[in-house]
Interface confidence: low
């Protein structure tokens, strides 16, 4: 589990209809994902076995899963 710590997180509902998902990967789910902070969506993220996880991007509004 995890949480969204971005200062932008609470802004997303205002723009909910503008952008949807923006993530994705294969086989193993990544622990965090980038959230579209201004335009309102967020995307799934999963990693293949041979790829290292993307870093948590606090200012980008990353969320734990």
């Amino acid at each position: 589990g995890g949480s969204c710590g971005s200062e932008h997180y609470n802004m997303t509902s205002e723009f909910e209809e503008m952008l949807g998902g923006s993530g994705g990967s294969e086989d193993i789910y990544l622990e965090e994902r980038k959230t579209i902070k201004v335009l309102g969506g967020s995307g799934g993220s999963v990693e293949t076995d041979d790829q290292s996880p993307e870093k948590i991007n606090i200012l980008g509004g990353s969320c734990g899963s």
């Epitope: 294969e26 789910y29 999963v46 980008g60």
Partner: antibody
């Protein structure tokens, strides 16, 4: 208004490289992945990969790995895809899209001698 | 890779009638965050794709409520009611729950 502006067309010889630009406006540039999708004439959509403009992090489709490079310039809100060692079957419309949500008009890349 | 199988490949619809397009995923599109990242895109002739629906059923601003997305897990449907001439084009489902992102093969909708 969200806009992704791309050049209309590029013509290249086989074996050459092409670099296609995508200038974004109307939203916070670093807030969405720029995704590259191509569409060969009369065919469906093919995902090439994506770049996170915030940190330059990339994911490439296996098919294009080693032949494609994504870059993003946050000073101009412009993303680029460069495809090298072009073949005739790379002839396609190349689209940039902000997280699949907003799409550019596409750039027709024609590979022909 | 996650495969998206769309059916039918083509449809011919009388104006005012309804149409339904199916998209079946090779694995569940439910992300570990509980969201399902399934889109429906519309591509009119000579134009770029445009997003109609995201996260299975959410319509973007400006998208008529004649377009309705539904489904869960691996089975998804786009319904178009009261078909209009301007609805002609190719419809794609797409997912970004997994890398690589993937697209259905498209459903061509013709207006009779």
């Amino acid at each position: 208004e969200v806009q992704l502006v791309q050049p209309g067309a590029e013509l290249r010889n086989p074996g050459a490289s092409v670099k296609v630009s995508c200038k974004a406006s109307g939203y916070t540039y670093t807030s969405a992945y720029i995704v590259w999708v191509r569409q060969a004439p009369g065919e469906g959509l093919e995902w090439m990969g994506r770049i996170d403009p915030e940190d330059g992090g990339t994911k490439y489709a296996q098919k294009f790995q080693g032949r494609v490079t994504f870059t993003a310039d946050t000073s101009t809100n412009t993303a680029y895809v460069e495809l090298s060692s072009l073949r005739s079957d790379d002839t396609a419309v190349y689209y940039c899209t902000a997280g699949l949500d907003y799409w550019g008009k596409g750039t027709l890349v024609t590979v022909s001698s | 890779a996650t495969m998206l199988t769309q059916s039918p490949g083509s449809l011919s619809v009388v104006p005012g009638e309804s149409a339904s397009i199916s998209c079946k995923a090779s694995q569940s599109l439910v992300h570990s965050d509980g969201m399902t990242y399934l889109y429906w895109l519309q591509q009119k002739p000579g134009q770029s794709p445009q997003r109609l629906i995201y996260r299975v059923s959410r319509r973007g601003s400006g998208v008529p409520d004649r377009f309705t997305g539904s489904g869960s897990g691996t089975d998804f449907t786009l319904n178009i009611s009261d078909m209009k001439a301007e609805d002609a084009g190719v419809y794609y489902c797409a997912q970004d729950t997994y890398y690589p992102y993937s697209f259905g093969s498209g459903t061509s909708v013709e207006i009779k």
